[in-house]
């Protein structure tokens, strides 16, 4: 519970955080798990303990590992473990994914990448920036503290973005990069009157005595976040949950966004053990939101079994 | 929200044990560790001890020790404080609580609603 | 064991006035915590980390200090602030509270 994943490149810089937390005053002892060996305090070590930070300076491929960090509060003592890759540096331009920092997204309003990790090295302005290998120039990037803005992004601003910073350790210079993937997303959202994709309206829909039934609710709003948008199914012009049938429930389905853009949801209405009364009420699909309220009613008809002898 | 259910009202007699309960709802059990605060009638707080339900393990006021025992049940997010050998000082109201960021230390943010334990003959 | 010592142990101040409760410790600790007790209620932890106001607790409280010396203040005197304040230490096992301030309104 308490783990986290870190790493990095050899012969960089690689700063990793107890996975605990603490008051800035307790004591923080690190270990390498698999020889339980302390890790030194001595900043004259490449690899040294600082209070609930453990430095690799460089790093080195053999650093990888699980290290544990016990922070002693004055009534427990509390276990972190931080799990270390450190791997061998790439001939080519290509960031495998294991490198990868969390993705970002950004729009024309919204267009900051923050270096990722930067807040635990002692470092100092310009940060470099690339993208795809390639060193940013021009106008429209800007590298401002921890983060680069990009000016008027367009959708061909996606891609892995690399930042690019000196860690200072007693006079001492290592280099750190840390890539994470910029997304572009399109601000233009719309909203409009509900579409029930399904079910048809008036449909009859067959069921077996005794088996089960479900029927789904599907409707689309608009395109982008929609600010109120819902689906829900009623029976006999009454709310599931006050109708009162255990063997009648519904149940939220996935938020769908197809490839059109449009944002839709779905309802399923589950019928346990389908009896002769069901068929005598009716089942409305509602799909509402801003801009009003759709209602596609289904029946139930009973479906004859197979006769197999015939 | 966070909330802790405390057991009811008891009353004991010299020599006995009791055992309080404290149900936690609200968050994840296992992520803080909960901490008894007694208080006697007209007095102040006093810190019994506290154990972590991830691991078992306990904390103790050495004023306490050996007398109180602390468990956690994962199963049912439950916090226990059984105290043996009652004398009629013990009588106070148990509270069990915890800390809002738990690593942090920063103050007992949450508490039960407190468990009145008398001691008579 | 570190002992708390809170004074006054008792006072009584009208609506509006400005309120200083004081709590020395036996040894230097690194933080402290202030509560508030109504009767027959549960404590409320008001100030933590010795000057952070917790979370939905109006602005009038505030606390500081550092060391063996600290000080809880109410800038101005409400009569929902009748009650019995506490201060507390988390430096050290066993963890301490004061004896506690009991605040009237006159």
């Known amino acids: 519970k308490f783990s986290k994943q870190s790493w990095g490149l050899e012969n960089e810089a690689l700063i990793v955080r107890c996975p605990r937390q603490g008051k800035p005053s307790y004591t923080v002892d690190w270990y390498y798990s698999q020889t339980n060996k302390s890790i030194p305090t001595q900043e004259r070590n490449r690899v040294f303990a600082s209070g609930q930070l453990l430095k690799f300076l460089p790093a080195a491929v053999a650093d990888s590992g699980i290290y544990t960090c016990i922070v002693r509060s004055p009534t427990f003592n509390r276990t972190g473990y931080a799990n270390v890759t450190i791997y061998k540096k790439q001939s080519d331009c290509n960031v495998p994914d294991y490198l990868m920092y969390s993705t970002v997204s950004g729009s024309e309003k919204n267009s900051k990448i923050y270096c990722p990790t930067i807040d635990l090295y002692n470092w100092t302005a310009p940060l470099e920036w690339f993208k795809n290998c390639q060193a940013l120039q021009g106008s429209r990037y800007r590298a401002h503290k921890s983060f680069l803005v990009i000016d008027n992004v367009m959708t061909e601003d996606a891609g892995d973005y690399t930042c690019k910073f000196i860690h200072n350790e007693n006079g001492a210079n290592y280099s750190v990069t840390a890539t994470r993937s910029f997304t572009v997303k399109d601000e233009q959202g719309f909203s409009l009157f509900p579409v029930i994709g399904a079910p048809a309206q008036n449909e009859i829909k067959e069921v077996e005595i005794g088996k089960n039934a479900n029927l789904t609710c599907s409707a689309c709003f608009g395109k982008g976040t929609q600010f109120l948008a819902a689906v829900l199914w009623q029976l006999n012009g009454t709310k599931i949950t006050d109708f009162g049938e255990p063997r009648i429930q519904q149940e939220e389905g996935q938020n769908q966004s197809f490839s059109n853009g449009l944002a839709c949801l779905d309802m399923v209405l589950r019928i346990a053990d389908v009896k002769e009364e069901d068929l005598l009420l009716q089942y409305d699909c509602l799909a509402l939101n801003l801009h009003g309220l759709r209602r596609h009613t289904v029946r139930l008809s009973r479906k004859n079994p197979i006769d197999h002898h015939s | 929200q966070v909330q802790l259910v405390q057991s009811g009202a008891e009353v004991k007699k010299p020599g006995a044990s009791v055992k309080v309960s404290c149900k936690a709802s609200?968050?994840?059990?296992?992520?803080?560790?909960m901490y008894w605060v007694r208080q006697a009638p007209g007095q102040g707080l006093e810190w019994m001890g506290a154990?972590?339900?991830?691991?078992?393990?306990?904390a103790f006021n050495q004023k306490f020790k050996g007398r109180v025992t602390m468990t956690a049940d994962k199963s049912t997010s439950t916090a226990y404080m059984e105290l043996s050998s009652l004398r009629s000082e013990d009588t106070a109201v148990y509270y069990c609580?915890?800390?809002?960021?738990?690593?942090?230390?920063?103050?007992?943010?949450?508490w039960g609603q407190g468990t009145m334990v008398t001691v008579s003959s | 064991d570190i002992q708390m010592t809170q004074s006054p142990s008792s006072l009584s101040a009208s609506v509006g006035d400005r309120v200083t409760i004081t709590c020395s410790a036996s040894?230097?600790?690194?933080?402290m915590h202030w509560y508030q007790q109504k009767p027959g209620k549960a404590p409320k932890r008001l100030i933590y980390?010795?000057?952070k106001l917790a979370s939905g607790v109006p602005s009038r409280f505030s606390g500081s200090g550092s060391g063996t010396d600290y000080t809880f203040t109410i800038s101005s005197l409400q009569p929902e602030d009748a009650a019995t304040y506490y201060c507390?230490?988390?430096?050290?096992?066993?963890?301490?509270f004061g004896q506690g301030t009991k605040l009237e309104i006159k």
């Open positions: 609580t915890r800390a809002f960021d738990n690593d942090n230390d920063d103050g007992f943010a949450y």
């Open positions: 609200g968050y994840t059990f296992t992520d803080s560790e």
């Open positions: 154990i972590d339900p991830e691991t078992g393990d306990t």
């Open positions: 040894s230097s600790v690194n933080y």
């Open positions: 980390d010795t000057s």
């Open positions: 507390q230490q988390w430096s050290s096992n066993p963890l301490t």
